[in-house]
Interface confidence: low
């Protein structure tokens, strides 16, 4: 399987909410011995590999934000800890998973990584990640709503997030 990032860049005004999204692509084993972890963290564009550095999002580690379930089951973070920090991660039946950040500040700007780990009990684990940039802007140049830029080069038209 692979992870797709529908949007590579999110440009948002301060105070807005944003939902960063990743999508699990390809065949997903739904067997009893397969479990999926999905999570989010901040990183930097390293020389060797993007997303190798794992930093917290608003002081929450990716352990705090993780979802675990089998196959394409739905899940979301219900614990108060994340919500107190204005964060919620969620996953649906179709392989989409996301993190919602509320009341953005300039400090939220940076590189965000989604990580999926497929664990096959007694066998191995397989990890894939996706990266996207969040730019939080203030002042007269800031957009009135979040503007997202598709990852694919052939589809460069801006899409305004709902």
């Amino acid at each position: 399987f692979k992870v797709a990032t529908p949007y590579s860049l999110y440009v948002c005004p301060e105070g807005q909410n944003v939902t960063l999204t990743c999508r699990l692509l390809g065949p997903v084993d739904k067997g009893h011995d397969v479990t999926f972890y999905k999570t989010w963290y901040r990183s930097s564009r390293g020389e060797v590999q993007t997303c190798s550095e794992r930093r917290p999002i608003r002081n929450l580690t990716f352990q705090d934000l993780h979802l675990h379930h089998g196959g394409h089951q739905a899940a979301n973070t219900s614990h108060d800890l994340a919500q107190r920090h204005g964060l919620e991660s969620a996953s649906d039946h179709h392989g989409n998973f996301s993190i919602t950040m509320r009341n953005l500040t300039l400090l939220d700007s940076g590189l965000y990584c989604c990580l999926v780990v497929e664990i096959r009990h007694h066998h191995s684990e397989h990890r894939v990640h996706g990266a996207m940039e969040l730019q939080v802007q203030t002042g007269k140049d800031a957009p009135s709503n979040c503007v997202v830029y598709p990852s694919s080069s052939q589809d460069s038209e801006n899409i305004t997030a709902a």
Epitope: Y37, G46, Q49, S52, I119, E125
Partner: antibody, heavy 120, light 107 residues
Amino acid sequence: QVQLVQSGAEVKKPGSSVKVSCKASGGTFSSYAISWVRQAPGQGLEWMGGIIPIFGTANYAQKFQGRVTITADESTSTAYMELSSLRSEDTAVYYCARSSYGWSYEFDYWGQGTLVTVSS
Amino acid sequence: DIQMTQSPSSLSASVGDRVTITCRASQSINNDLNWYQQKPGKAPKLLIYAASSLQSGVPSRFSGSGSGTDFTLTISSLQPEDFATYYCQQNRATPITFGQGTKVEIK
């Protein structure tokens, strides 16, 4: 601060079994992979297997398959490693190790080690 | 299984020296490579994770590089407390495997 505290040294006869415990404190237990790594005298590090308590099932190195059992008790935040059919070459220090990164196998927390001596 | 081969198996160096230890994987492991330091009678200590990320609390004289199959641990200026055995470890796939170790001794 996470701490892993292991049970004390053991002296065992060949053919018997040993069960070593590893109690975690200072952090959540269930979602983190706990591994067992052994080191024979003067030798290198050897991964035996690991368990993610929330999943309940363990993952073993082929070399130990059928002879090692790794379990976890979420209620006491304790992981166990049982090795059966002991032989002299199993004499080693056995470490439990854990990652800060949940399911991963980057070991930034280690127990103090448990010396298991197999001798007739 | 993924085999990890370290070189050299031992080396002698002086305080202040620049020391380089290499680790080679039998197949590509991307950057899923960690380095540990172990002193006699003690548990290993994580120095570098993800090939090049410095573990919190580890002095900046330690650095890691590489990707794929070839990796390097560098100590830019060896200190007295750095004399120890160093291990690489891949966590790309289970079974987890370690290199055989490199003992850094005082010249």
